[in-house]
Each structure stands twice: as structure tokens, then as C-alpha cells.
């Protein structure tokens, strides 16, 4: 056998080159046939009407033909025949790769609530061979479950990702990335997660700055509440007691002027949104005013008093007890 061919892999729409090569040429005729065994070329003559076949080289040692705009129907065995005695035949297999036509990502709901599990689907349509789908949340790879559907030698792959969302996932992209021999570079599509979460509450003492609360002083506390959607209600309450008469509430701020010992207690900032309710506590302890010592007549004594301030903030972010978790469906 001195007739040789090589298998060809080509991407749909591109050019395949078929070569029939003779090692020891004796001027025998070379013929190229298609998978239906119709003659494409007999020497330099093309009996087929298909003008996508073009003669690249014709000699006693080679018949080289190009096939432009390859389609999946061109796939199969192409036969080289050498008219020796006895005749020789060799075949080359053309494999056509088809990149996915379309890449679609579908998210179960536009907005999810923290702790909820959502379904994300990605479909790569009509490829050959079947596409491999990879999932990423930001830079972290996740594992999906793929199903392959075959129709007329083409494959549609759907990958399902079940994703439990956390508040940190808000604004993070979920990426569906395909790997396919006909695709060079990165073919991907993404959707950004929108995660609703209950408020996180933090109390800031804005006055006095040194943090020591004495009788007669003023106290200013600011409640910072962050959630999604942004908390609609921020309220101050005094735990197990009435709010002092001289306390002033202004949005997220609580002012208590002219502090006295009866103001001692726990002050709670509560914030809520459609996901849930959370609070943070501030324990107020009012210290005695600084004592003034009258100046001595003869001796000067300097006394240094060190006061230790204990500032305790208790944060409780239980959702569902005081507030209801509600999923938003669109």
C-alpha cells in the first residue's frame, strides 16, 4: 500500500483540505470520492457540481482538494483511489466541529433572599461534540448538573446549578463558561446576583467622644443599619422601661441631655426591612460627676484619679422571631 491520507477535523463554515498522497508514483490515476462514493475528482476533473470543492494540487504523486464552507452534512469518510493493478483505496475521515449556537443563562428569580436556594440554568445549543459547561460564582468554581439532548448529530447541553445565596453574594456575577474544541478563548455569559438580606445594626456613640457618661452630660447615639432593601424603619426603644422624658429621637439618632442615674439601662436600636428585623443594644451607665476638691491653704497635693469605663454593646440579629422573612417573586 503506497496511498496515504490523513484524517481532517474542521470547524463548521471553515475550510477542510483533503489530500491523497502516493509514495512511489507510477503515474497511476488518483480519484477522490465522497462518503456516497460519488467522484469528487478524477485526476484534475471534477464531475460534481459542488463548487465548494477546489483543486489545490494535482500531480502523479498527490491529489489535494479543498472544501470550503464545510457543513455537518459533509462529515464522513472520503475515499482516495489509486488505479494500480490491483487498485488501492484509502480513506480519510472528515470530522466537523460545530460551536454552540447560543449560550443562555436563566436565573430562577431576579431577586433572592439570603439563605434561599435558587436554581440557575445555562444552555449551550446545537454543538458538536457536546459542550462542557463550567460554573463560577465570582472566581470560585461551582459544580452543576448537566443534561445532554441529542438531535440530528447535534447536542444541546443544559447545566443546572443549585445555589444557596448569602448576603455577601449580592452583586457577585454567576458565570456560565463553555469549553468546546471549536471555541477558542473564553465563551461565557453571566448574570449578577441580587440578594436581599435583613439589616445589620451597629450603634455608634457620637458624644461624648471619650466614651465616659457622667451625670449632667449629654449623650448622643447614632444607629447605623445596613440591609437590602435599605431598612425602612429604624427605631429606638428603652428595654424594660420608658424612654426618658428628656430624650430626643431624630431618625437614627438618640439624644439624651442632662444625664442622670435614672437614665441607666439598655437602649435598643431596632431596624427592619422586608426580609427581617434586627437590633443592637447599648447599655448606659451614668457615672458620678467629677468631684471638685477645694484648694488647700498650705500644702499642694496632686491627686490623679483613673476611671475605667465599661462600654458594652450587645448585638442581636435574629430574623424571623420579631420579623418575617418574605421571598420576593417576580
Amino acid at each position: 500500500q503506497n496511498l496515504f491520507t490523513k484524517d481532517v477535523t474542521v470547524i463548521e463554515g471553515e475550510v477542510a483540505t483533503i489530500s491523497c498522497q502516493v509514495n512511489k508514483s507510477d503515474d497511476s490515476v488518483i480519484q477522490l470520492l465522497n462518503p456516497n462514493r460519488q467522484t469528487i475528482y478524477f485526476r484534475d476533473f471534477r464531475p460534481l457540481k459542488d463548487s465548494r470543492f477546489q483543486l489545490l494540487n494535482f500531480s502523479s504523486s498527490e491529489l489535494k482538494v479543498s472544501l470550503t464552507n464545510v457543513s455537518i452534512s459533509d462529515e464522513g469518510r472520503y475515499f482516495c483511489q489509486l488505479y494500480t493493478d490491483p487498485p488501492q483505496e484509502s480513506y480519510t475521515t472528515i470530522t466537523v466541529l460545530v460551536p454552540p449556537r447560543n449560550l443562555m443563562i436563566d436565573i430562577q428569580k431576579d431577586t433572592a433572599v439570603e439563605g434561599e436556594e435558587i436554581e440557575v440554568n445555562c444552555t449551550a445549543m446545537a454543538s458538536k461534540p457536546a459542550t462542557t459547561i463550567r460554573w463560577f460564582k465570582g472566581n470560585t468554581e461551582l459544580k452543576g448538573k448537566s443534561e445532554v439532548e441529542e438531535w440530528s448529530d447535534m447536542y444541546t447541553v443544559t447545566s443546572q446549578l443549585m445555589l444557596k445565596v448569602h448576603k455577601e453574594d449580592d452583586g457577585v456575577p454567576v458565570i456560565c463558561q463553555v469549553e468546546h474544541p471549536a471555541v477558542t478563548g473564553n465563551l461565557q455569559t453571566q448574570r449578577y446576583l441580587e440578594v436581599q438580606y435583613k439589616p445589620q445594626v451597629h450603634i455608634q456613640m457620637t458624644y461624648p467622644l471619650q466614651g465616659l457618661t457622667r451625670e449632667g452630660d449629654a449623650l448622643e447615639l447614632t444607629c447605623e443599619a445596613i440591609g437590602k432593601p435599605q431598612p425602612v424603619m429604624v427605631t429606638w426603644v428603652r428595654v424594660d422601661d420608658e424612654m426618658p422624658q428628656h430624650a430626643v429621637l431624630s431618625g437614627p439618632n438618640l439624644f439624651i441631655n442632662n444625664l442622670n442615674k435614672t437614665d441607666n439601662g439598655t437602649y435598643r436600636c431596632e431596624a427592619s426591612n422586608i426580609v427581617g428585623k434586627a437590633h443592637s443594644d447599648y447599655m448606659l451607665y451614668v457615672y458620678d460627676p467629677p468631684t471638685t476638691i477645694p484648694p488647700p491653704t498650705t500644702t499642694t497635693t496632686t491627686t490623679t484619679t483613673t476611671t475605667t469605663t465599661i462600654l458594652t454593646i450587645i448585638t442581636d440579629s435574629r430574623a424571623g422571631e420579631e420579623g418575617s422573612i418574605r421571598a420576593v417573586d417576580h
Epitope: F42, R46, P47, S51
Partner: nanobody
């Protein structure tokens, strides 16, 4: 101007014979390989036979081997196809063509109809 004119077609019964001719002009006939190609109703083109420049080497498709004979007369610039033991599947339009390495069917004849039927 290149011209290829086929003749000799017609209606024949299965088992019968016909001889097709192709008169060539407008090119140096003796310098080119010559071919017979056919197209059956509703089918693609099928290569039937080939002959080298001098006529010493002939080639046939498996479907006609042993029944058809290709020949040429370089002095008369004519190509022939002797068809024996005709079958109904030989029904087609027969074209003659020359292998000039040029793509397409620009240098083919108009064809002659062969119908094999009882």
C-alpha cells in the same frame, strides 16, 4: 470557442445497446483527457468513464464496468461511449467533458438523453 456536442441518445429496451458520440472543437482535443458523466432524474452527477490523451488508458465507474467502453478518435476530434447490456438504472442525461483542470462545468456539452425502458 470550446464546443462539445453529444449525440446518439434515445429510447432503448433493457439489454439493448447504444453508441454515444461527442464532437469536440475549439481546443486541442488530443492534448486532453476526456470524460463521460451522467445525471439520472432527481440524482446528482455521476462520473461514468475516462480516457487518457492517447486512448491507451481507460477507466470506468463500478456501475458500468464490463458493459460500457470509452474510446476516442483524435483525428476526428470525437469521443465515443459504447453502451451494452443497458439497464433501467442507466437512464440519464449523458454529458461529455474534458479535463482541463478548470473548475466547474463551463466546458461540458449540453448532454444527450438515454432512456432504458420496456
Amino acid at each position: 470557442q470550446v464546443q462539445l456536442v453529444e449525440s446518439g441518445g434515445g429510447l432503448v429496451q433493457p439489454g439493448g445497446s447504444l453508441r454515444l458520440s461527442c464532437a469536440a472543437s475549439g481546443f486541442t482535443f488530443s492534448s486532453y483527457w476526456m470524460y463521460w458523466v451522467r445525471q439520472a432524474p432527481g440524482k446528482g452527477l455521476e462520473w461514468v468513464s475516462a480516457i487518457n490523451t492517447g486512448g491507451g488508458s481507460t477507466y470506468y465507474a463500478d456501475s458500468v464496468k464490463g458493459r460500457f467502453t470509452i474510446s476516442r478518435d483524435n483525428a476526428k476530434n470525437t469521443l465515443y461511449l459504447q453502451m451494452n447490456s443497458l439497464k433501467s438504472e442507466d437512464t440519464a442525461v449523458y454529458y461529455c467533458a474534458y479535463g482541463n483542470g478548470v473548475e466547474g462545468m463551463d466546458y461540458w456539452g449540453k448532454g444527450t438523453q438515454v432512456t432504458v425502458s420496456s
